[in-house]
């Protein structure tokens, strides 16, 4: 089982220093600041699932040097920043979505010896990201469709 921690209060102070190794902001309808970094130097697991996020501002994650698992499931992501994707040791947990194509390509080109990248469908089943992209995301489809949400149901 994955580790877990209790959801933080909905009123998040982004200026606060978080000392925990796990932070759970799941389902809080958060809007992540674009010009501010989360202050959580110990965090290894960050749960941002179910927040309606369309993007992951790279500045927000800039100081999370210990981060190992980033859960962004159930967010309508339209893009994943290249600088975030290039963090080879970061385990991104995200919905199967054509917007992950850039993440997949950057990992493939910059990160050696990686385990296969996974994504999750609407039934919470895991899929190989490469296979999903191949089947569900024709060339140019992700950028042409805005949010790029093309779930592959099995």
């Amino acid at each position: 089982l994955e580790p877990s921690c209790t959801v933080s209060s909905a009123d998040v102070d982004w200026n606060a220093e978080f000392s925990a190794t796990c932070l759970n902001f799941s389902g809080l309808s958060l809007s992540l600041p674009h010009n501010q970094s989360l202050r959580a130097s110990n965090v290894i697991l960050l749960d941002l699932s179910g927040n309606g996020l369309r993007e992951l501002p790279v500045t927000f994650f800039a100081h999370l040097q210990k981060l190992e698992v980033l859960n962004v499931l159930r967010n309508p992501l339209s893009r994943v920043d290249g600088a975030l994707a290039a963090r080879c040791d970061l385990d991104l947990q995200a919905d199967c979505n054509c917007a992950l194509e850039s993440w997949h390509d950057i990992r493939r080109d910059n990160c050696s010896g990686q385990k296969p990248l996974l994504c999750w469908d609407t039934t919470s089943s895991q899929h190989n990201l490469s296979a999903f992209l191949e089947v569900s995301c024709a060339p140019g489809l992700a950028s042409a469709t805005g949010s790029g949400h093309h779930h592959h149901h099995h």
Epitope: P3, C5, S19, C22, N24, N42, K66, D89
Partner: antibody
Framework: QVTLKESGPGILQPSQTLSLTCSFS??????????VSWIRQPSGKGLEWLAH???????RYNPSLKSRLTLSKDTSSNQVFLKITSVDTADTATYYC?????????????????WGAGTTVTVSS | DIVMTQSPKSMSMSVGERVTLTCKAS??????VSWYQQKAEQSPKLLIY???NRYTGVPDRFTGSGSATDFTLTISNVQTEDLADYHC?????????FGSGTKLEIK
């Protein structure tokens, strides 16, 4: 096979500086997520976490001892060092180093999977 | 600091019985709790991590459960080789802290 082995002076006098070495093999402390902690245990008592050093040389200390602790590592020789200044009889204990691994399958956990056998330190005048 | 309180301090059981050790955290630590077994004159060995995950090679008679503040280590069908001290520890927040231990004796 992952192993860790602590070494120290055995006996020292109050007010002296305790220098401990953790020599390890079977893993690299330059691997992302990897780390080593020092934990001590007075005879017949519980465990007390002292300090942790990360792969990137970042360090965390127990606030109750922070002013007396200095943690360092030599990645190339697979060693971690802990110095405790101004020791007292209360520092008499068995000192362990333990590894925190990076779990690539189901990450985000934090635990100590391998411990050294420990080195006994006695502070006595 | 987060205080981890273990109970009982010691217990004596017969071979084949079921043992339940408890650990209570002074504040919510999610599932960031591990259990360690320490036999006489030996270093601690990892049994359970993430509150309920059995570590590699640990017999399946050892089971961990709980979250937030209340955690349990259960040993079903206790064996003579289970004679040891058992420590719980939290890694949710620095400084990491351990319980004072439970000594398991075998009748």
């Amino acid at each position: 096979q992952v192993t860790l082995k602590e070494s120290g002076p055995g006996i020292l006098q109050p007010s002296q500086t305790l220098s401990l070495t953790c020599s390890f093999s079977g893993f690299s402390l330059s691997t992302s997520g990897m780390g080593v902690s020092w934990i001590r245990q007075p005879s017949g008592k519980g465990l007390e976490w002292l300090a942790h050093i990360y792969w990137d040389d970042d360090k965390r200390y127990n606030p109750s001892l922070k002013s007396r602790l200095t943690l360092s590592k030599d990645t190339s020789s697979n060693q971690v060092f802990l110095k405790i200044t101004s020791v007292d009889t209360a520092d008499t204990a068995t000192y362990y180093c333990a590894r925190r691994p990076r779990d690539y399958y189901g990450g985000g956990h934090w635990y100590f999977d391998v411990w050294g056998a420990g080195t006994t330190v006695t502070v006595s005048s | 600091d987060i205080v981890m309180t273990q109970s009982p301090k010691s217990m004596s059981m017969s071979v084949g019985e079921r043992v339940t050790l408890t650990c209570k955290a002074s504040e919510n630590v999610g599932t960031y709790v591990s259990w360690y077994q320490q036999k006489a004159e030996q270093s601690p060995k990892l049994l359970i991590y993430g509150a309920s995950n059995r570590y590699t090679g640990v017999p399946d008679r050892f089971t961990g459960s709980g979250s937030a503040t209340d955690f349990t280590l259960t040993i079903s069908n206790v064996q003579t080789e289970d004679l040891a001290d058992y420590h719980c520890g939290q890694s949710y927040s620095y400084p990491f802290t351990f319980g004072s231990g439970t000594k398991l004796e075998i009748k």
